[in-house]
Interface confidence: medium
């Protein structure tokens, strides 16, 4: 059963599935200037048996015959229904989630694919949210949404995620704006929101005690 609508929109956040339930479809979209080959599949489908799941069909893009390479690829009518898009890459994937029974891993890229993937999710699919670059999560807790069937209708649960962005106050001299990372988390592989080498915190103590307090500081 396909989910009727998109996962909820969270301000300054994007979502990604760690693994895809059997029945999920991924549109075969091509980047500008390319199109699907004539006999090519419209979509890839996650299928499987009790022990193994994989993507059926292959997406293939070829150079467009027309010279107008700025023309957007127009989706087929059946593709315009239930457009779920994701372009978020995340290093936070639980390693064992993608090997869940009845789930497919993220499909490998195909040549000249579009920058944004469009999925058609099924009931039971879980997606994970995280804040986009320059934003941070303000609360602990699971930032996930599940497509559920309730009273014959599908709905997505509401993820508990609030993203805040204060680039003016959190940007320090000599630092570049951060790249996308989980929940706006600083990453040393890219640039940092706050570098841990420069960032220091030090405790000082003042005691107002009726009893005595003896303190020593670790250096």
């Amino acid at each position: 059963e396909l989910c009727d609508d998109d996962p909820p929109e969270i301000p300054h956040a994007t979502f990604k599935a760690m693994a895809y339930k059997e029945g999920t479809m991924l549109n075969c979209e091509c980047k500008r200037g390319f199109r699907r080959i004539k006999s090519g599949s419209l979509y890839m489908l996650c299928t499987g048996n009790s022990s193994h799941s994989s993507w059926d069909n292959q997406c293939q893009c070829t150079s467009s015959a027309t010279r107008n390479t700025t023309k957007q690829v127009t989706p087929q009518p059946e593709e315009q229904k239930e457009r779920k898009t994701t372009e978020m890459q995340s290093p936070m994937q639980p390693v064992d989630q993608a090997s869940l029974p009845g789930h497919c891993r993220e499909p490998p890229p195909w040549e000249n694919e579009a920058t944004e993937r469009i999925y058609h999710f099924v009931v039971g699919q879980m997606v994970y949210y995280q804040c986009v670059q320059g934003y941070r999560a303000l609360h602990r807790g699971p930032a996930e949404s599940v497509c559920k069937m309730t009273h014959g209708k599908t709905r997505w649960t509401q993820p508990q995620l609030i993203c805040t962005g204060e680039m003016e106050t959190s940007q320090f001299p000599g630092e570049e704006k951060p790249q996308a990372s989980p929940e706006g988390r600083p990453e040393s592989e890219t640039s940092c929101l706050v570098t841990t080498t420069d960032f220091q915190i030090q405790t000082e103590m003042a005691a107002t005690m009726e009893t005595s307090i003896f303190t020593t500081e670790y250096q």
Partner: antibody, heavy 105, light 107 residues
């Protein structure tokens, strides 16, 4: 003992008004780590329920520091107290050097 | 509160050994699990966040895995500087809670 413990954490190398929570964690001698509470620069706080009635955490943005007050201390509050930057779902990545507090009667 | 249980509480190993420490949560915490290393007289140091992501500057011999309730920290080849106490911490809910620690000693 019925005194109040006051600790201040000075933040350098960045603004305390950045999008971070700031936590206090303590460690009794020879024991594990216990989270005390945290504060956001707006003044929003979260406290450990086990200590909530005795804990106050505040922030002073002008001095780029945040503070812990623990009231009605006893010997059980003897510990090394750490302050840390808390990335919420992604752990505490920057820590203060720690201050040893000994409460004796 | 979510309770974290580490095992073993201590272990003896030699340089070059492969060391595995486990952490179990009292309820599912998805992948919101972090690992810290602490040496005597020093503050904890973040090693792994989100169950399996290596904190910047941490050697690649450290790795983390798991999801749900069961998690593992692995040191592929123990080095002299790795003898320390290791803590897991859940950040799924407030208050964040730590495991009781695993002390890695020289055999």
């Amino acid at each position: 003992p019925s005194g109040t413990l006051s600790l201040t954490c000075a933040v350098s190398g960045g603004s305390i008004s950045s999008s971070n929570w700031w936590s206090w964690v303590r460690q009794p001698p020879g024991k594990g780590l216990e989270w005390i509470g945290e504060i956001y620069h707006s003044g929003s706080t979260n406290y450990n329920p086990s200590l909530k009635s005795r804990v106050t955490i505040s922030v002073d943005k002008s001095k780029n520091q945040f503070s812990l007050k623990l009231s009605s201390v006893t010997a059980a509050d003897t510990a090394v107290y750490y302050c840390a930057r808390d990335l919420m779902n992604y752990g505490m990545d920057v820590w203060g050097q720690g201050t040893t507090v000994t409460v004796s009667s | 509160d979510v309770w974290m249980t580490q095992s073993p509480s201590s272990l003896s190993a030699s340089v070059g050994d492969r060391v595995t420490i486990t952490c179990r949560a009292s309820q599912s915490i998805s992948s919101y699990l972090n690992w810290y290393q602490q040496k005597p007289g020093k503050a904890p140091k973040l090693l792994i966040y989100a169950a399996s992501s290596l904190q910047s500057g941490v050697p690649s011999r450290f790795s983390g895995s798991g999801s749900g309730t069961d998690f593992t920290l692995t040191i592929s080849s123990l080095q002299p500087e790795d003898f320390a106490t290791y803590y897991c911490q859940q950040s799924y809910s407030t208050p964040p809670t730590f495991g009781q620690g695993t002390k890695v000693e020289i055999k």
